[in-house]
Every structure is written in structure tokens, then in C-alpha cells.
Amino acid sequence: GSVPPMVNVTRSEASEGNITVTCRASSFYPRNITLTWRQDGVSLSHDTQQWGDVLPDGNGTYQTWVATRICQGEEQRFTCYMEHSGNHSTHPVPSGNSHHHHHHHH
């Protein structure tokens, strides 16, 4: 059967006026997954995103990540979109004082 991913969005200061947002998916099976950043619901172009490899996490499941740099103050426009085994979810960027949002999807 399939195991849905845990999805976790974090933010970190990049350069002046910019932040890096990272979306991590972990503990999922099978390994096929779509993970992408969207702006206003539209996927960002590939050249503005960085992806990690889909790697085994040691429990028979997998993990991966995608990151992009955005302008501070524009966070509300951006979401991380995940598709796995016919299910999907959307994950917002956490506010500045909250660095971790975990969601398990079934």
C-alpha cells in the first residue's frame, strides 16, 4: 500500500528583503511524488526552484525537498503543492515567528 508524506514548510532569511522557503516531504511510499512551489496557484518555473533527490529515509519510505527564494512580504502568494498516490495537498508559508508546519496526509 501507499504511505502518505509528512509535509513540512520552513523559512529562513536569505539576503536583504528575501527569504528562502523550503518544503520537505518525508516518510512516503512509493517514491513517486510531485512537490513544487506555486505563486498564486501557478507553478514556479523550474529555473527558480531547487529540488533535492528522492532518497530512502531508512524506514522503507522516502524523503525529498524543494526550495525557492521569494520576496519578504509576499509569503501569502506562495504555497507548496504536493501530489502523491492520487492525493494532493497545499501548504502555506508559515508566518515569521512560526518556523515549522507539519501535516500528515491520508
Epitope: 505563486q39 498564486d40 496557484g41 501557478v42 504555497t79 503543492y81 494532493h88 497545499t90 502555506p92
Partner: antibody, heavy 118, light 108 residues
Framework: EVQLVQSGAEVKKPGASVKVSCKAS????????IYWVRQAPGQGLEWIGY????????IYNQQFKDRVTITADTSTSTAYLELSSLRSEDTAVYYC???????????WGQGTLVTVSS | EIVLTQSPATLSLSPGERATLSCSAS???????LHWYQQKPGQSPRLLIY???NLASGVPARFSGSGSGTDYTLTISSLEPEDFAVYYC?????????FGQGTKVEIK
């Protein structure tokens, strides 16, 4: 086949409110944003706002923020646009549209004509 | 707000001729955020070209798009009768999302 089917034409008095619906089918409703756009007679297109039905986030064009409410009912795959304090210049065709993978508006509803007249 | 200015407002051409439509932005936008739509009388707009130069599904190859920065162009290499319509450019780079005022391509 992706379809966005909107409610029928409305005639309203100045000061009244109107609520237009947009029923989506042919795709997973919560996987794409629903945008609202209007077009006054003989005029161009004007973006009103959008909703992300999965998380319920709404972004408005500031020009409309005080008079517009966008909502979505995921159980019926339907989005709604409510416009209050109507005035004659709100007479327009109101369109819903779906966000695409690579563009803001990839599928459109058939439009709903709202006429504001005393 | 990014203002998109389309020119000309009206283009009068005959079938078979080449149409060149311009869209000028009030400030620079990434080519990833510039799209074109076609609208025929009494119909909803239809996505024509996304991200400056990519044809939407079902759009004939006579349509093409180009540009960068503040200047973008939609070209129809040889007009067919069904191409006579209004064309809008749209930017998705910054809020509010905005459209150009449209260029009407009419039969001469």
C-alpha cells in the same frame, strides 16, 4: 473535461448585493485556485481576487476588498463571489477561472452578466 | 500596479496577412509571468500563449509569442477567418494581476 459552470444573469438595484456561483467539474477542485475576473460592457478584463480552496486562503485586488467576498464550498466543488453595495459601474460580466500549471487563467466559466439598474 | 499598454488598439487586416500585436509593461516583468488570451464576441477569454512563448493546448502553430523585460509581442503569421477577435496580454508577476486593454483584430 474541465468545466466551470456559472449561475445565471442577475438584475439588481443600486445598493443591493449579488452572489454569483461557479461549479467546477472534471478535476480535483482543491488542487487549483479559483479566480474571479470582471468585464464591463465593451471594456477590458479586471482581476477581482482568488481563493485557494484547499487552505481557504483568499487574495483580493485591493480595489475591491471592501465590497467583495470570495468563498468556496469544497463539498460541492463550488466557488462564490459576493459583491455588495452595488452601483451602476458594477454592471459587467463576471467570470470565474481556474489557475493553471503555468498560467493564471487556464479554463474559464461562461460568464454571468450582472446588471445594476434602478 | 503594473500597467500593460497594448498597441495598436485596433488592427485592420485581411485573411492571410501577418498580425503583430504589442504589449508594453510599465515596469519590467519576468517572461514567465506574461500570458496572452483571445476573446471572441459573446465568448469567454481563452488561454492562447503562456509564459511569453508557449502555445496553450490546441492553439495552432501560426500563433507565436516573444519578448522580455517590458516589451512583449504576439504574432499571427497568416490570419485565418477565426482569428479575428480581441487579444489581451496579462501579467502574473505582481499583485494586482493586470490585463492590457486589448487589441481588436478586425477584418479589413
Amino acid at each position: 473535461e474541465v468545466q466551470l459552470v456559472q449561475s445565471g444573469a442577475e438584475v439588481k438595484k443600486p445598493g443591493a448585493s449579488v452572489k454569483v456561483s461557479c461549479k467546477a467539474s472534471g478535476y480535483a477542485f482543491t488542487s487549483n485556485n479559483i479566480y474571479w475576473v470582471r468585464q464591463a460592457p465593451g471594456q477590458g478584463l479586471e482581476w477581482i481576487g482568488y481563493i485557494d480552496p484547499y487552505i481557504g486562503r483568499i487574495i483580493y485586488n485591493q480595489q475591491f476588498k471592501d465590497r467583495v467576498t470570495i468563498t468556496a464550498d469544497t463539498s460541492t466543488s463550488t466557488a462564490y463571489l459576493e459583491l455588495s453595495s452595488l452601483r451602476s459601474e458594477d454592471t459587467a460580466v463576471y467570470y470565474c477561472s481556474r489557475s493553471g500549471e503555468r498560467s493564471n487563467f487556464d479554463y474559464w466559466g461562461q460568464g454571468t452578466l450582472v446588471t445594476v439598474s434602478s | 500596479e503594473i500597467v500593460l499598454t497594448q498597441s495598436p488598439a485596433t488592427l485592420s487586416l485581411s485573411p492571410g496577412e501577418r498580425a503583430t500585436l504589442s504589449c508594453s509593461a510599465s515596469s519590467s516583468i519576468s517572461s514567465n509571468y506574461l500570458h496572452w488570451y483571445q476573446q471572441k464576441p459573446g465568448q469567454s477569454p481563452r488561454l492562447l500563449i503562456y509564459r511569453t512563448s508557449n502555445l496553450a493546448s490546441g492553439v495552432p502553430a501560426r500563433f507565436s509569442g516573444s519578448g522580455s523585460g517590458t516589451d512583449y509581442t504576439l504574432t499571427i503569421s497568416s490570419l485565418e477567418p477565426e482569428d479575428f477577435a480581441v487579444y489581451y496580454c496579462q501579467q502574473g508577476g505582481s499583485l494586482p494581476l493586470t490585463f492590457g486593454q486589448g487589441t481588436k483584430v478586425e477584418i479589413k
